[in-house]
Amino acid sequence: ALDAAYCFRNVQDNCCLRPLYIDFKRDLGWKWIHEPKGYNANFCAGACPYLWSSDTQHSRVLSLYNTINPEASASPCCVSQDLEPLTILYYIGKTPKIEQLSNMIVKSCKCS
Amino acid sequence: ALDAAYCFRNVQDNCCLRPLYIDFKRDLGWKWIHEPKGYNANFCAGACPYLWSSDTQHSRVLSLYNTINPEASASPCCVSQDLEPLTILYYIGKTPKIEQLSNMIVKSCKCS
């Protein structure tokens, strides 16, 4: 799996999970989230050559097409596979609210 | 939806469905498929700016992050959303076989 266990310990040009810490205020301009101040969002990036973690039959066909026709502009892309929620604390007036924001943290990647 | 109805009639730099015909023999080097000789595989490509068809909360956050931090290398990617199968005819020896290859045709795209 193209997850932290694999990607964070290997130097990897190909599609892999990359670390990304997002500070809500600094990076997104959000002041409405009280806690946490930021979180490890991570992201997916890297090349998708033939045989590298293809998601579907189409993405594998596309990577083969791209290998045989390197001048082609059609190629698969490295995107998130497994995501996890993030629990946040915010306020409506003076009332604290705890909310779970779905699909906020990328845990693994794929070529799609 | 970022499908043929929308994308093929609009000139679109942003994430959209793009036409791609794949000739099995010429483009993939495949002789094993007897029929069809090729098919409209299509592919997804284009930029994923903020508010453009984000798939998940994470991809929306990432596009906002990328808008506020344009020097960042982290951004969502345009990938397939809906896919359809392709029915093919091939031979095992002299015996004809009809098979449905799943997820071979891209019908729409998303920013993920």
Epitope: R60 | G29, W30
Partner: nanobody, 118 residues
């Protein structure tokens, strides 16, 4: 169930040659896309070369002009002729077959070590 067995690896001096072979059994070999992939210690896995059932081939830039991939469907074999070997070619080389029906599946050999050193 496809079985792949590689042979031909070994120790060779820089500038030397080796020929890797891969024998397949248990599948319609004539329709699969065959490839050689390699992994050096501490480096990412890398596609070296591939060859389709229609004999279309492709190579990673670093081996173009030095390596030649070929296949013989009647004998169910594939080979990789490696000339002008360099120390950076040192890796475990894997034979890979991709069958496309009824669903896509990759079959990997156990690998053969190639060491280029003086």
């Amino acid at each position: 169930q496809l079985q792949l067995v590689e042979s031909g690896g070994g120790l060779v001096q820089p500038g030397g040659s080796l020929r890797l072979s891969c024998a397949g059994s248990g599948i319609a070999f004539s329709r699969v896309t065959m490839a050689w992939s390699r992994q050096a210690p501490g480096k990412q896995r890398e596609l070296v070369a591939l060859i389709t059932d229609g004999n279309r081939s492709a190579y990673v830039d670093s081996v173009k002009g030095r390596f030649t991939i070929s296949r013989d469907n009647t004998k169910k074999t594939m080979s990789l002729q490696m000339n002008d070997l360099k120390p950076e070619d040192t890796a475990v080389y894997y034979c890979v077959a991709t069958d496309w029906v009824p669903t896509r599946r990759d079959y990997w050999g156990q690998g053969t070590q190639v060491t280029v050193s003086s």
